[in-house]
Interface confidence: medium
């Protein structure tokens, strides 16, 4: 059901039909669900070809990236957004997510965060989840607005299952990982638990359900006694170095 499909807490309206149906032009990737990309006639868009990672919102990108159209004015209907490198101090910005960690957007410029006068919970944009009555989105803007968490979430470290933006929002022993339509605090993996080995940095973006990384002193390796037909589907577990 593509009506009202959500991406990391954001609703995307007026999606083109999946799998290259009418309106789905080849090359115009639309992220229908966290990690599920429909592009042209291909069922999946993988990262093996080293293309930029398409996104619909900042949370789908790494902590040192933000989501935007590669060229100004290209983010209208059908325009593809990708993860771009964050902007350093004193660079131009339009929102906090564009600035690199430790900075925030003030008067259009990335400035160092001064937590003494700018509490963490207020660093995010003040447009807290207003998609429900966002007329622009309903009018056919194919991409969601950035959503943020209420500031109270930042005052105490998130417990297992609570919504987060990044791992530092979570209590000790937890990381922030994608789950359902948002990101939540999940337990860091223990020895013997199944882990996900990524082919390259950033490929975790294709997972609807992200696992945390392996705990201290552990590495994600192929389970030695796990034999399967294809190498690509071998089970990885957290193992001692």
């Amino acid at each position: 059901t593509l009506n009202s499909v959500l991406i990391n807490s954001n609703a995307i309206k007026n999606l083109p039909p999946p799998l290259g149906g009418a309106g789905g032009q080849p090359g115009s990737a639309v992220s229908v669900a966290p990690g599920v990309l429909y592009e042209g006639g291909n069922k999946y868009q993988t990262l093996d070809n080293y293309q930029p990672y398409p996104c619909a919102e900042d949370e789908e990108c790494g902590s040192d990236e933000y989501c935007s159209s590669p060229s100004r004015g290209a983010a209208g209907v059908g325009g593809v957004q990708i993860c771009l490198a964050c902007r350093k101090r004193r660079k131009r910005c339009m929102r906090h997510a564009m600035c690199c960690p430790g900075n925030y957007c003030k008067n259009g410029i990335c400035m160092p965060s001064d937590h003494s006068h700018f509490p963490r919970g207020e660093i995010e944009e003040s447009i807290i989840e207003n998609l429900g009555n966002d007329h622009n989105a309903a009018a056919g803007d194919g991409y969601p607005r950035r959503t943020t968490l209420t500031s109270k979430i930042y005052h105490t470290k998130g417990q297992e299952g609570s919504v987060c933006l990044r791992s530092s929002d979570c209590a000790a022993g937890l990381c922030c990982a994608r789950h359902f339509w948002s990101k939540i605090c999940k337990p860091v993996l223990k020895e013997g638990q199944v882990c996900t080995k990524h082919k390259r940095k950033g490929s975790h973006g294709l997972e609807i359900f992200q696992r945390c990384y392996c705990g201290e002193g552990l590495a994600c390796r192929i389970q030695k006694d796990h034999h399967q037909a294809s190498n690509s589907s071998r089970l990885h577990t957290c193992q001692r170095h």
Epitope: S9, A33, E129, I153, I208
Partner: antibody, heavy 116, light 111 residues
Framework: QVQLVESGGGLVQPGGSLRLSCAAS????????MSWVRQAPGKGLEWVSG????????HYADSVKGRFTISRDNSKNTLYLQMNSLRAEDTAVYYC?????????WGQGTLVTVSS | DIALTQPASVSGSPGQSITISCTGT?????????VSWYQQHPGKAPKLMIH???NRPSGVSNRFSGSKSGNTASLTISGLQAEDEADYYC??????????FGGGTKLTVLG
């Protein structure tokens, strides 16, 4: 401890309306997505609807789309399900569930019977 | 509609091990590598037993374990006990971000 208590179920005629409530306690309600799941008598579980932590984003199963509306009031720690144009096939026990690591906590359910 | 297929019933004697299977398609169980399992006693609410295919929430006995191979997920209960008698449901998400449950399996503990 986490507690979810549903209320508002009952007998209603086909085409009628009903509003279910789910009172949450024991956790920071506004930090979690919430869901409704139903179970027809003697049948399996069917996911009905989900709502984001602030309430602005909602998602529905095809079977209830356009008839049911999920909402929440974080100031009251309460989840709602407004059910309109009810049909006989909507007869079920309706559970509210917290969407943490999966549907990690469930209420005891409230029975909705649609019959003439 | 995407469906997850479970056996209608499974039985075992106390102390034995039993396995409940959950078969899906590449767009749900196989594609996402993510399955959860719920236990439901008669007249009670479901309880999460396994998430992420094989992880147990705190408070769940280590007699319960989950695994996945291809498009089939499995729940294994070792050292079967009388209180394990219940209905068990697998669930996952399909490509359209719908939450999908299996039809359920009734576990009977013999004797």
């Amino acid at each position: 401890q986490v507690q979810l208590v549903e209320s508002g179920g009952g007998l209603v005629q086909p085409g009628g309306s009903l509003r279910l409530s789910c009172a949450a306690s024991g956790f920071t309600f506004s930090s979690y997505w919430m869901s409704w799941v139903r179970q027809a008598p003697g049948k399996g579980l069917e996911w009905v609807s989900g709502i984001s932590y602030s309430g602005s984003n909602t998602h529905y199963a095809d079977s209830v789309k356009g008839r049911f509306t999920i909402s929440r009031d974080n100031s009251k720690n309460t989840l709602y399900l407004q059910m309109n144009s009810l049909r006989a096939e909507d007869t079920a026990v309706y559970y509210c569930a917290r969407m943490g690591i999966d549907l990690d906590y469930w209420g005891q359910g409230t029975l909705v019977t649609v019959s003439s | 509609d995407i469906a997850l297929t479970q056996p209608a019933s499974v039985s075992g004697s106390p102390g034995q091990s039993i396995t409940i299977s959950c078969t899906g398609t590449s767009s749900d169980v196989g594609g996402f590598n993510y399955v959860s399992w719920y236990q439901q006693h008669p007249g009670k609410a479901p309880k999460l037993m396994i998430h992420d295919g094989s992880n147990r929430p705190s408070g769940v006995s280590n007699r319960f374990s989950g695994s996945k191979s291809g498009n089939t997920a499995s729940l294994t209960i070792s050292g079967l006990q009388a209180e394990d008698e219940a209905d068990y449901y697998c669930s996952t998400w399909d490509m359209t971000v719908d939450f999908v449950f299996g039809g359920g399996t009734k576990l009977t503990v013999l004797g």
